[in-house]
Interface confidence: medium
C-alpha cells in the first residue's frame, strides 16, 4: 500500500530513508532538456524475495531534441556535481543489497537524472531526520517517521525533532551537512539521526552506521 503523503516537514530539517521497503517506487525523471526515452521505464521498483531485494527497471534519459538516442547509467563527474546537496546519496553502496531484509539501498544515479528524486513510499517505511547546516537538534526524541496504516488510511508518525538556529551543529565528526532546499522542504530524502531500525533495535548512530551513507555529494 502506497503512503498517501510525503513524510512530515520539520522546519530546518531534512529526511532520508536508509533503505527502501519492497514496493517503493522511484520516478524516472530527467533533468531539464532531457526526457525519458519512449520505451524506457516509468519508474524503478524495489522488489525481491526473502533473501534478496533489488531495483527492477532502469531509468533512461535522452536529449529532448533527440528522439532515438538512449544514453544511460553512470553520469560524468561534471554531471554528478549538478545534483543538489540535499540528496545525501551514497553511490558507494551496492544497488541490490540492503542491510535489512526486504529492503533496497539507494539506487545509483543515471545519466541526465533530474536534480530531485521523487519516491513513492509504502506502509512500514521509516525515514530519519537531521537538522540542516546552521541548526542543531534541541529535542532529541526519536527523530524518525514511519508510514502507518490506521483505519484504512495511511499516515506518517510525527518525528520528535526541533531544530534551533544556533551555529553549533549536531553533525557527526567529519560529516558535511546538507543545505536546506529553497522552498524549505527536502528536495529528496536526506540524512538523519537514527534511533531505531525497522526492527525497533535501539542503535547509536555514530557507533553503528558508516558515515559514508551521509555524504552530501557524489564523490
Amino acid at each position: 500500500e502506497l503512503c498517501d503523503d510525503d513524510p512530515p516537514e520539520i522546519p530546518h530539517a531534512t529526511f532520508k530513508a536508509m533503505a527502501y521497503k519492497e514496493g517503493t517506487m522511484l520516478n524516472c525523471e530527467c533533468k531539464r532538456g532531457f526526457r525519458r526515452i519512449k520505451s524506457g521505464s516509468l519508474y524503478m521498483l524495489c522488489t525481491g524475495n526473502s533473501s534478496h531485494s533489488s531495483w527492477d527497471n532502469q531509468c533512461q534519459c535522452t536529449s529532448s531534441a533527440t528522439r532515438n538516442t538512449t544514453k544511460q547509467v553512470t553520469p560524468q563527474p561534471e554531471e554528478q556535481k549538478e545534483r543538489k546537496t540535499t540528496e545525501m546519496q551514497s553511490p558507494m553502496q551496492p544497488v541490490d543489497q540492503a542491510s535489512l531484509p526486504g529492503h533496497c539501498r539507494e539506487p545509483p544515479p543515471w545519466e541526465n537524472e533530474a536534480t530531485e528524486r521523487i519516491y513513492h513510499f509504502v506502509v512500514g517505511q521509516m525515514v530519519y531526520y537531521q537538522c540542516v547546516q546552521g541548526y542543531r537538534a534541541l529535542h532529541r526524541g526519536p527523530a524518525e517517521s514511519v508510514c502507518k496504516m490506521t483505519h484504512g488510511k495511511t499516515r506518517w508518525t510525527q518525528p520528535q525533532l526541533i531544530c534551533t538556529g544556533e551555529m553549533e551543529t549536531s553533525q557527526f565528526p567529519g560529516e558535511e551537512k546538507p543545505q536546506a532546499s529553497p522552498e524549505g522542504r527536502p528536495e529528496s530524502e536526506t540524512s538523519c539521526l537514527v534511533t531505531t531500525t525497522d526492527f525497533q533495535i535501539q542503535t547509536e548512530m555514530a557507533a553503528t552506521m558508516e558515515t559514508s551513507i551521509f555524504t552530501t555529494e557524489y564523490q
Partner: nanobody, 123 residues
C-alpha cells in the same frame, strides 16, 4: 477535501487551439501525477496525458504531438494545450490526480476526478 476544477472548455472550429486548465486544492500534490482524460458520448473515458511533479510526461498515442501537458507546481495547476483540434476531439475533458509515479493510468484506478469541461470542435 481534494478538489479539481477544470476550466477553458468551449466551442471551437476544426484546426483551432484551446488551452484547458485544472486547479487542484485540498492537499499537497507532490506525490501525485496530474492527468487529463476525456469522454465522448457513448464511449469509455480515455487517458490523454499525465505529468509528474518534476515534469515527467506521458501521452496517449492518439494525442502525442498535438496536445501538450504542463504543470505549475506553486499554483497546483495543470494545463492541457490542444492544437490542431479535430471534430473527433469533441468530448468532456476531465482532470485527474493519481497517487504514484507517472504511468498511463487506467480510469478506474484514479484517486480524484474533476467535474469535467465540455470541448466541442465544429467542422
Amino acid at each position: 477535501q481534494v478538489q479539481l476544477q477544470e476550466s477553458g472548455g468551449g466551442l471551437v472550429q476544426a484546426g483551432d487551439s484551446l488551452r484547458l486548465s485544472c486547479a487542484a486544492s485540498g492537499r499537497s500534490f507532490r506525490n501525485y501525477i496530474l492527468a487529463w482524460y476525456r469522454q465522448a458520448p457513448g464511449k469509455e473515458r480515455e487517458f490523454l496525458a499525465a505529468i509528474s511533479w518534476l515534469d515527467g510526461t506521458f501521452y496517449a498515442n492518439s494525442v502525442e504531438g498535438r496536445f501538450t501537458i504542463s504543470r505549475d507546481n506553486p499554483k497546483n495547476t495543470v494545463h492541457l494545450q490542444m492544437d490542431g483540434l479535430k471534430p473527433e476531439d469533441t468530448a468532456v475533458y476531465y482532470c485527474a490526480a493519481d497517487r504514484g509515479p507517472v504511468r498511463p493510468v487506467l480510469a478506474p484506478d484514479v484517486d480524484y476526478w474533476g467535474q469535467g469541461t465540455q470541448v466541442t470542435v465544429a467542422s
